[in-house]
């Protein structure tokens, strides 16, 4: 950033790095919990039509896939990676891709991913080896 750009940055709204760039809040898919047809696939689209601007600049995109004996749901939200989500630490929060990791939960199959590129939780990946292919 040129020197004329003010160094004063409200950390609740924006953040800055050592190179002088300013971080605006991320754009993420944000449909909360929705029923999903994503099952036994290497990758899926979220089918969430809502793109939200996260409240804080450090928040990242998150997707949570859950399957139990009743249904399959996909949750898409923004979340602060410093805080746990559903009791789990957000791994790979700086990743450009949302690569699902299984978490141990009683009574259901539970996968979660986090990423930090705009709308990156729109395309969720269950098999890292297929990250270059298009969604099923």
């Amino acid at each position: 950033i040129p020197p004329h750009v003010p160094k004063s940055v409200n950390s609740d709204v924006m953040a800055s790095d050592n190179g002088g760039a300013v971080k605006l809040p991320q754009l993420c898919k944000f449909c909360d919990v929705r029923l999903s047809t994503c099952d036994n696939q290497k990758s899926c689209m979220s089918n969430c039509s809502i793109t939200a601007i996260c409240e804080k600049p450090h928040e990242v995109c998150v997707a949570v896939w859950r399957k139990n004996d009743k249904n399959i749901t996909l949750e898409t939200v923004c979340h602060d990676p410093k805080l746990t989500y559903h009791g789990f630490t957000l791994e790979d929060a700086a990743s450009p891709k949302c690569v699902m990791k299984e978490k141990k939960r009683a009574g259901e199959t539970f996968f979660m991913c986090a990423c930090n590129m705009e709308e990156c939780n729109d395309y969720i990946i269950f098999s890292e080896e297929y990250t270059t292919s298009s969604p099923d």
Epitope: I1, D17, V22, K23, L24, P25, L27, N116, E118
Partner: nanobody, 119 residues
Framework: EVQLLESGGGLVQPGGSLRLSCAAS????????MAWVRQAPGKGLEWVSR????????YYADSVKGRFTISRDNSKNTLYLQMNSLRAEDTAVYYC????????????WGQGTLVTVSS
Amino acid sequence: EVQLLESGGGLVQPGGSLRLSCAASGFTFSEYDMAWVRQAPGKGLEWVSRIRSDGVRTYYADSVKGRFTISRDNSKNTLYLQMNSLRAEDTAVYYCAKDRAKNGWFDYWGQGTLVTVSS
């Protein structure tokens, strides 16, 4: 060299309108998201609006939603901000900024244009 040059600021009465422009050069404008960010006197930076590279998807801070409209003309390498129903609290220096890599980091800024809303 990347350059962003804002224009269109000035003094306007409350309830009035202004249209800001930002002429871009030195990069492939149509490939990058752009944003308007402002700084009110004595305050920190506040993001105002953001537009995707395709010009279709737009986003606004709650404080300007319904009053401001962001747009772009990729054939003219120009970003716009139409500001209607201006309020005293909209008084600020307005900067246009270029996204670095679709990750929310904006790395190039213009010199800014001052908008003063006062009667």
